[in-house]
Interface confidence: medium
């Protein structure tokens, strides 16, 4: 793992404990909470990051859905179960034996049940829509410049292959970034769109997960792009299964 040798830290994940106890005295970093070894040359999985983050859950809020099957993370934070590769286990349960199924970004996609609840597979989130509203500026941003800057950000900061940034839409003051990545498209070593979206979300909130790097300073042709609010919608390869009661609530 390419953790910084001199001071033995993980550039892509500050929520780690690092020590030079790897093969040949190399720096090895383990995620807080799970103790799993992480690859510091790329993004850490969202599951391990959530596991490491021990803060109180955020209040639920009903939000806009871009389609009847779109999910929004209304449940906030929880302490997830991750598999040996750091992915979310399809079934998540809390300490009171209440269980539910999640998608590949850890968002609940079924009603809650008891320990008998079955989640046959981890359903992939193949389309993520990041909806941002920017603070007022003297004028609208140039769409082409905005598009280029956001694509550069996902490529350089989050190491997401450009082909997975499907589109950047702009209608002042709203920006929508569409990330798309089917199971068949994702090759070994590719950053997952769910992980990239999570790092971006934390960056936007001023809670950067990167070690030692300054916070996100987004600029379009020198003009600061300051985000007022963010909504993230998740669309799964298989539509979620909720009772009608929840869908009409």
């Amino acid at each position: 793992h390419t953790a910084a040798q001199d001071n033995c830290t993980c550039p892509t994940n500050k929520m780690t404990v690092c020590s030079p106890d790897g093969p040949g005295g190399r720096c090895q970093c383990r995620a807080l909470g799970s103790g799993m070894a992480v690859d510091c040359s790329t993004l850490t999985s969202k599951c391990l990051l959530l596991k490491a983050r021990m803060s109180a859950p955020k209040n639920a809020r009903t939000l806009v859905r871009p389609s009847e099957h779109a999910l929004v993370d209304n449940d906030g934070l929880y302490d997830p179960d991750c598999d040996p590769e750091g992915r979310f286990k399809a079934r998540q349960c809390n300490q009171t034996s209440v269980c539910w199924c999640v998608n590949s970004v850890g968002v609940r996609r079924t009603d809650k049940g008891d320990l008998s609840l079955r989640c046959d597979e981890l359903v992939r989130t193949h389309h993520i829509l990041i909806d941002l509203r920017h603070r007022p500026t003297a004028g609208a941003f140039n769409h082409s410049d905005l598009d280029a800057e956001l694509r550069r950000l996902f490529r350089e900061r989050y190491r997401l292959h450009p082909k997975f940034v499907a589109a950047v839409h702009y209608e002042q003051p709203t920006i929508q970034i569409e990330l798309r990545q089917n199971t068949s498209q994702k090759a070994a070593g590719d950053v997952d769109i769910g992980d990239a979206a999570y790092y971006f979300e934390r960056d936007i909130k001023g809670e950067s997960l990167f070690q030692g790097r300054g916070g996100l300073d987004l600029r379009v042709r020198g003009e600061p792009l300051q985000v007022e609010r963010t909504l993230i919608y998740y669309l799964d390869e298989i539509p979620p299964k909720f009772s009608m009661k929840r869908l009409t609530a």
């Epitope: 806009v64 209608e171 709203t174 929508q176």
Partner: antibody, heavy 121, light 107 residues
Framework: EVQLQQSGPELLKPGASVKISCKAS????????MHWVKQSHGKSLEWIGG????????NYNEKFKDKATLTVDESSSTAYMELRSLTSEDSAVYYC??????????????WGTGTTVTVSS | DIQMTQSPASLSASVGETVTITCRAS??????LAWYQQKQGKSPQLLVY???TLADGVPSRFSGSGSGTQYSLKINSLQPEDFGSYYC?????????FGSGTKLEIK
């Protein structure tokens, strides 16, 4: 069936204010932004502004910024437009129309029934 | 702000004829253009969006085309119910301006 039902005609004196309503039915109110359009007699259409129901975020045409105020009441799936300091120039038919929140799909797919506002002394 | 120049202002045609209405934007609107039909005393109705996509329930005799700054709406084999006013509207950036309209009348 998706419908946008607007309030009835208004006859007002110059300097007065009026609040027009647009009640949505047949769809999830918060999945769409609500926009308002002015059509003066025998003339073209003018976009006044739009509102994002979840947050009350508004977007106005500069021309109407001091004239119109857009609000929504999510509980009743109703959008409102208040027009103030009315003059004869404000006499027109006003339409509400909806637009999906998805920016890759941009159009007004459903229009309200229209509200006629007449300003006369 | 982007201005929309629509032409012609009025047009007389007979049932069965083909007509074309054009809209020119003052800047590139990247195909974010919609066309509406409005009958006398009625609300506008969506015909075409994203420059070329026909709205649900719109007959196939209507078609949209164009890119960049130049767009057009073509109506093949005019039917009696097609007469009325037509408006284009861009959605590239706010304000979402409309064209001045084209009144299509029976010859």
């Amino acid at each position: 069936e998706v419908q946008l039902q607007q309030s009835g005609p208004e006859l007002l004196k110059p300097g007065a204010s009026v609040k027009i309503s647009c009640k949505a039915s047949g769809y999830t109110f918060t999945d769409y932004t609500m926009h308002w359009v002015k059509q003066s007699h025998g003339k073209s259409l003018e976009w006044i502004g739009g509102i994002y129901p979840n947050y009350g975020d508004t977007n106005y045409n500069e021309k109407f910024k001091d004239k119109a105020t857009l609000t929504v009441d999510e509980s009743s799936s109703t959008a409102y437009m208040e027009l103030r300091s009315l003059t004869s120039e404000d006499s027109a038919v006003y339409y509400c129309s909806r637009k999906t929140v998805l920016l890759r799909l941009r159009y007004f797919d459903v229009w309200g029934t229209g509200t006629t506002v007449t300003v006369s002394s | 702000d982007i201005q929309m120049t629509q032409s012609p202002a009025s047009l007389s045609a007979s049932v069965g004829e083909t007509v074309t209405i054009t809209c020119r934007a003052s800047g590139n609107i990247h195909n974010y253009l919609a066309w509406y039909q409005q009958k006398q005393g009625k609300s506008p109705q969506l015909l075409v969006y994203n420059a070329i996509t026909l709205a649900d329930g719109v007959p196939s005799r209507f078609s949209g085309s164009g890119s960049g700054t130049q767009y057009s709406l073509k109506i093949n084999s005019l039917q009696p119910e097609d007469f009325g006013s037509y408006y284009c509207q861009h959605f590239w950036s706010t304000p979402f301006t409309f064209g001045s309209g084209t009144k299509l009348e029976i010859k």
